[in-house]
């Protein structure tokens, strides 16, 4: 069976720098050539799209400049890695993969990454 | 309701042109190719050609027995494609469709016949 | 470009199974999607990448692939699956798509 299925990583720490990455795998039916990924997040029940970047297969995942997000792509994996979080952005990161050619469109939806992201403790005031 | 719509279908002499229009809403035009299907009275259904999405720079592809005859184009800004046919046969008779695959108009009926 | 071999007809009972094959060299390396094609009606996509079957179709559309035959399934046939069924793949080397030459299912 060819139908496709998307894997994340059910949770990520992210880094004190305000970093995260986690691989999106999908089971591509077919021989796609043009694959979207987008990154959406839900927080208390809201789906907003954190990034996309649409690829020719062979070719590099590249995000808008301004982006948040930036990634590489070998194969049917995805390797995401998101920028700039803080704690209020803690949340569930979908990963939505679209098969865009060849037709028939195809559509796939990981279960979800839970990025939890922790600010840093501000640095103490040191006395000499 | 996604929808293609075809129009643009009727009765044309041998060798005279038709251009047959498809309109799309409510799914992502823009990022799909569209095909042009057709059937002949009692025949299975014939690819004749298709314009990519704007990722692949809407260039086009066509089955053997149409190229050099017929021509596909889009305009994605009115979520439209053509498919414009010259010097038509009478063997072109038939129920043309637009598709993304996913999606298909209803058709029009093209009659070449004199 | 690969040819896609599918019966002309297939009759089945009301409430049996109807298997409708499209035979194609090594067609389990393909996605091989299907359409249902009724008179007068557009053709729909029933299922999709061997199995999957878009929202709107029923359980009882199921489709498999293996070897060199790719396999349509239809269980409690009822009248209103009579049909003209086509199988499709996309031949990667013209990048273009194939269709067989279609299957007419009668339901007796």
């Known amino acids: 069976c060819k139908a496709m299925h998307v894997a994340q990583p059910a949770v990520v720490l992210a880094s004190s720098r305000g970093i995260a990455s986690f691989v999106c795998e999908y089971a591509s039916p077919g021989k796609a050539t043009e694959v979207r990924v987008t990154v959406l997040r839900q927080a208390d029940s809201q789906v907003t799209e954190v990034c996309a970047a649409t690829y020719m297969m062979g070719n590099e995942l590249t995000f808008l400049d301004d982006s948040i997000c930036t990634g590489t792509s070998s194969g049917n994996q995805v390797n995401l890695t998101i920028q700039g979080l803080r704690a209020m952005d803690t949340g569930l990161y979908i990963c939505k993969v679209e098969l865009m050619y060849p037709p028939p469109y195809y559509l796939g939806i990981g279960n979800g990454t839970q990025i939890y992201v922790i600010d840093p403790e501000p640095c103490p005031d040191s006395d000499f | 309701e996604v929808q293609l719509v075809e129009s643009g279908g009727g009765l044309v002499q041998p060798g005279r042109s038709l251009r047959l229009s498809c309109r799309g809403s409510n799914f992502n035009f823009d990022d799909l190719a569209i095909s042009w299907v057709r059937q002949a009275p009692g025949k299975g259904l014939e690819w004749l050609g298709f314009?990519?999405?704007?990722?692949?720079?809407?260039?086009?592809d066509y089955v053997a027995s149409v190229k050099g005859r017929f021509t596909i184009s889009r305009d994605d800004s009115k979520f439209i494609a053509w498919l414009q046919m010259d010097s038509l046969k009478t063997d072109d008779t038939a129920v043309y469709y637009c598709?993304?695959?996913?999606?298909w108009g209803q058709g029009t009926l093209v009659t070449v016949s004199s | 470009q690969p040819v896609l071999t599918q019966p002309p007809s297939v009759s089945v009972a009301p409430g049996k199974t109807a298997r409708i094959s499209c035979g194609g060299n090594n067609i389990a390396s393909e996605a091989v999607h299907w359409y249902q094609k009724k008179p007068g009606q557009a053709p729909v996509l029933v299922i999709y990448?061997?199995?999957d079957r878009p929202s709107g179709i029923p359980e009882r559309f199921s489709g498999s692939n293996s070897g060199n035959t790719a396999t349509l399934r239809i269980s409690r046939v009822d009248a209103g699956d009579e049909a003209d069924y086509y199988c499709q793949v996309w031949d990667r080397t013209t990048d273009q798509p194939v269709f067989g030459g279609g299957t007419k299912l009668t339901v007796l």
């Open positions: 990448y061997d199995s």
């Open positions: 314009v990519r999405s704007k990722a692949y720079g809407e260039t086009t």
């Open positions: 598709t993304t695959f996913n999606y």
